[in-house]
């Protein structure tokens, strides 16, 4: 090296890593290093993880004079020490209403009737334990089985014999099988009863309410009922009154008022008459008319009061 | 209840050898670190090996003191630890305990201990 | 290797006297510290560990302190069966470390 240009070994300092540079003779230096550095320029970190003490399983990973633990998902902390809530982290660790219990290092489930499983998702097969009679089928459902029936078997576990197969219930009543004993159960359709079926049922003598409205009268039938109106009235329980106005009966351009079982026409002047159909002789309208308007009002009355409402005179 | 005992202590002469063993129960032995710690009489704690558990490959640690002369085994079918000692010195006469790691950086469970004399 | 320095070697006390212990390490141990309590002829017990935590089953009268190199524990009412020696051990990495120990006697 040339006088003008003379090496100085710590100038610039050759160590590396905030090691400090001391000349220890003309050409000659030592670096002493930060901890957790090593070599002549302490261009090395020293490797802190062969005394690692990560645990429950955490890797080492080194670092600067210190090492950090990369921890499993059940653990945390700077060692993993420190134990993962797993129920509150994850709200549906257990599946179908199982109940969460935390643990060092990981989380228990107790799970309800019928599932299983580490996380409650797996259904019990119910059918593994089950007895349904040979010749049937097992179906698994959550904590408990069904069994389906060959034909002319039936109960719980197709254990007997199904006491439908002789039709015993009548005019086309629905039959179903007692899954405890066999016995048939027959569902009666309207206006039948009886174990089989097989029994009328009075309508008529039911004790509460006559099924005819308005009086109508109550006769018995096979199956069912029918109802004989009072004039005035229709439909399969006389709850129809009739309206006689609607053939209009009332002439001479009369107005028509429905009454129960009957009609009355307003006649217009000069008319008279069930149907307003006689003329009235002019030489004695005076006394006519106030003859019509009374019975006019006599109806009129009738009319109201039979309705239970309160006609006022002007 | 986790349970450590340790067994095999004795008499031997300098340069001789020894093997202790260590009996667990009450927990999964391979989850845990297990350490060797010795005491001199009248004296201090002392360190003086480690395996790791199975997820940190049962990986192994010593004491200057004890390298090259002391080897830490476990037979997790047995459930048990070994510590062999070879080219025993006088200076290595303590009781030997066997400790479990217990994941919290402490050292958890202890067995009863086990006395070692090396003396001629 | 971490250097443990354990002070006092020996304390004299009385019964429902509050003791402390003190434990400072060579580096920082990042509160991997554990306390344990050895009467005569038997194995250790951990009492605390993390520094700070209580291990189960232990009287809540005994607690740890601490972070970076500088931990204590504390017995709060020191009672009859609490006259043992005492060790600080830290955790942060091998070798594991132990201080020298710290005799409680009755006064």
């Known amino acids: 090296a040339g006088s003008d240009n003379p090496y100085v070994p710590c100038a610039p300092s050759p160590c590396v890593n905030g090691g400090t540079c001391r000349q220890t003779g003309d050409f000659t230096f030592e670096c002493s290093c930060l901890p957790g550095f090593e070599g002549s320029t302490c261009e090395r970190n020293i490797d802190d993880c062969p005394n690692h003490r990560c645990q429950n399983g955490g890797v080492c990973v080194d670092g600067v004079n210190t090492y950090n633990c990369r921890c499993p998902p059940q653990w945390t902390g700077q060692f993993c020490t420190e134990d993962v809530d797993e129920c509150l982290l994850q709200p549906n660790a257990c599946q179908n209403g199982g109940t969460c219990t935390n643990r060092n290092g990981g989380y228990g489930c107790v799970c309800v009737n019928g599932w299983s499983g580490d996380d409650c998702s797996e259904n019990i097969d119910d059918c593994a334990f089950a007895s349904c009679t040979p010749g049937s089928t097992c179906i698994d459902r959550v904590a408990s089985f069904s069994c389906m029936c060959p034909e002319g078997k039936a109960g719980l576990l197709c254990h007997l014999d199904d006491a439908c197969i002789s039709n015993p219930c009548h005019k086309g009543a629905l039959c179903d099988t007692n899954p405890l004993n066999g016995h048939y159960i027959c569902t009666c359709p309207q206006g039948y009863k009886g174990a089989d079926c097989t029994e009328d049922v009075d309508e008529c003598a039911m004790t509460n309410s006559n099924p005819c409205e308005h009086a109508g009268k109550c006769v018995n039938t096979d199956g069912a009922f029918h109802c004989e109106c009072l004039k005035g009235y229709a439909g399969p329980r006389c709850e129809m009154d009739i309206n006689e106005c609607h053939s209009d009966p009332c002439q001479n351009d009369a107005t028509c008022l429905d009454k129960i079982g009957g009609f009355t026409c307003l006649c217009m002047p000069g008319f008279k008459g069930v149907h307003c159909e006689i003329e009235i002789n002019e030489g004695n309208s005076g006394l006519n008319d106030i003859f019509e308007a009374q019975k006019i009002e006599w109806h009129e009355n009738l009319y109201f009061q039979g309705h239970h409402h309160h006609h006022h005179h002007h | 209840e986790v349970q450590l005992v340790e067994s095999g202590g004795g008499l031997v002469q300098p340069g001789g050898s020894l093997k202790l063993s260590c009996a667990v129960s009450?927990?999964?032995?391979?989850?845990?670190?297990m350490e060797w710690v010795r005491q001199a009489s009248g004296k201090g704690l002392e360190w003086v090996a480690a395996q790791r558990n199975k997820a940190n490959d049962f990986s192994i640690v010593y004491s200057a003191s004890v390298k090259d002369r002391f080897t830490i085994s476990r037979d997790d079918s047995k459930s048990t630890l070994y510590l062999q000692m070879n080219s025993l010195k006088t200076e290595d006469t303590a009781v030997y305990y066997c400790?479990?790691?217990?994941?919290?950086?402490?050292?958890?469970?202890w067995g009863q201990g086990t006395l070692v004399t090396v003396s001629s | 290797d971490i250097q443990m320095t354990q002070s006092p070697s020996s304390v004299s006390a009385s019964v429902g006297d509050r003791v402390t212990i003190t434990c400072q390490t060579s580096?920082?141990?990042?509160?991997?510290l554990a306390w344990y309590q050895q009467k005569p002829g038997k194995s250790p017990k951990l009492l605390i560990y993390?520094?700070?935590r209580l291990q189960d089953g232990v009287p809540s009268r005994f607690s740890g302190s601490g972070s970076g190199t500088d931990y204590t524990l504390t017995i709060s009412s020191l009672q009859p069966e609490d006259f043992a020696t005492y060790y600080c051990q830290q955790g942060f990495k091998y070798p594991l470390t132990f201080g020298g120990g710290t005799k409680v006697e009755i006064k």
């Open positions: 009450g927990f999964t032995f391979s989850d845990f670190y």
């Open positions: 993390g520094a700070s």
């Open positions: 400790s479990r790691d217990g994941g919290k950086l402490a050292l958890d469970a």
């Open positions: 580096e920082d141990i990042y509160s991997g």
